[in-house]
Interface confidence: medium
């Protein structure tokens, strides 16, 4: 079957994402996927995009993310305003109302970011071949 | 409510400096950057610098050099200071707050600057 | 420095008219563009952020669309809205505006 267009939008968004490093992609969220193995693929997306949501929440107007310069500042921008369109993708695919985020494993937004990455082409990959 | 007042008129000779205040209100100030944009008689909108955040700035190409913004947290307040004036400069002065990232969402009322020996 | 064009500069309409402004940006500003509208002796007003996006109280006969370089702002039906409109970027500083289109009484 063929590819949910949402999920092509979320690895397009992942790919802007990782392509550069901002002030705040060294800070840590929580880390979903260190003990995902009993957990479903909605679960996980719901759970990721929880996670997004949090992050983004609490550091939209953080200064030391917004930096001291305009450089940093247009940066940042656009690393808030892709962690919303991938937070509302990931809800659109997920399809739950909520879910919860125990965890106590931490990792940098960057890394979770190269991992939901790597998860989504695979799905990828299945679902177009 | 959010408000932006601004100081009064202000008439300068050329060569002389002038610093408009902008005193803000009904928000947390450090949350939003504050913008400075100026409108000469009859014409249109011209950006001139922006504090942000941080408290940091950045400034347009035309004004470097004789612009300065600067803010007082305590009290809330943002200032612009133009130095050098020429005729030119005549202009009325609107500080604007940045919403989060898009937009300047609330004005101050203007501040009228003449030059003019 | 982005440049942003707004043409019309000026134009006549009559109440009930539906208005077309629109503005090219020199390079691509993705969807940060904002709209303003000043009535004479006033502060400028925010009407649309973010291209599309109707700011608080903004009424819907207010719309905007666009993405890149090329943006518009439609009045669907004009009422009181006699005034001077300017687009904005906010993409990359400097932050930059339109020249302004006057909408007038026919």
């Known amino acids: 079957h063929k590819c949910d267009i949402t999920l092509q939008e979320i690895i397009k968004t992942l790919n802007s994402l990782t392509e550069q490093k901002t002030l705040c992609t060294e800070l840590t969220v929580t880390d979903i996927f260190a003990a995902s193995k009993n957990t479903t693929e909605k679960e996980t997306f719901c759970r990721a995009a929880t996670v997004l949501r949090q992050f983004y929440s609490h550091h939209e107007k953080d200064t030391r993310c917004l930096g001291a310069t305009a450089q940093q500042f247009h940066r940042h921008k656009q690393l808030i305003r892709f962690l919303k369109r991938l937070d509302r993708n990931l809800w659109g695919l997920a399809g739950l109302n909520s879910c919860p985020v125990k965890e106590a494993n931490q990792s940098t937004l960057e890394n979770f970011l190269e991992r939901l990455k790597t998860i989504m082409r695979e799905k990828y990959s299945k679902c177009s071949s | 409510e959010v408000q932006l007042v601004q100081s009064g008129a202000e008439v300068k000779k050329p060569g002389a400096s002038v610093k408009v205040s902008c005193k803000a209100s009904g928000y947390t100030f450090t949350d939003y950057s504050m913008h400075w944009v100026r409108q000469a008689p009859g014409q249109g909108l011209e950006w001139i610098g922006v504090?942000?955040?941080?408290?940091?700035?950045y400034y347009a190409d035309d004004f470097k050099g004789r612009v300065t913004i600067t803010r007082d947290t305590s009290t809330s307040t943002a200032y612009l200071e133009l130095s050098s004036l020429r005729s030119e400069d005549t202009a009325v002065y609107y500080c604007?707050?940045?919403?989060?990232?898009?937009?300047?969402?609330?004005w101050g009322q203007g501040t009228l600057v003449t030059v003019s020996s | 420095d982005i440049q942003m064009t707004q043409s019309p500069s000026s134009l006549s309409a009559s109440v009930g008219d539906r208005v077309t402004i629109t503005c090219k940006a020199s390079?691509?500003?993705?969807?940060?563009a904002a709209w303003y509208q000043q009535k004479p002796g006033k502060a400028p007003k925010l009407l649309i952020y973010?291209?599309s996006h109707r700011y608080t109280g903004v009424p819907s006969r207010f719309s905007g669309s666009g993405s890149g370089t090329d943006f518009t702002l439609t009045i669907s039906s004009l009422q009181e809205d006699f005034a001077t409109y300017y687009c904005q970027q906010d993409y990359t500083s400097p932050w930059t505006f339109g020249q302004g289109t006057k909408v007038e009484i026919k």
């Open positions: 604007a707050r940045g919403g989060i990232f898009y937009g300047m969402d609330y």
């Open positions: 504090i942000f955040q941080s408290g940091a700035t």
């Open positions: 390079q691509s500003v993705i969807n940060d």
């Open positions: 973010y291209t």
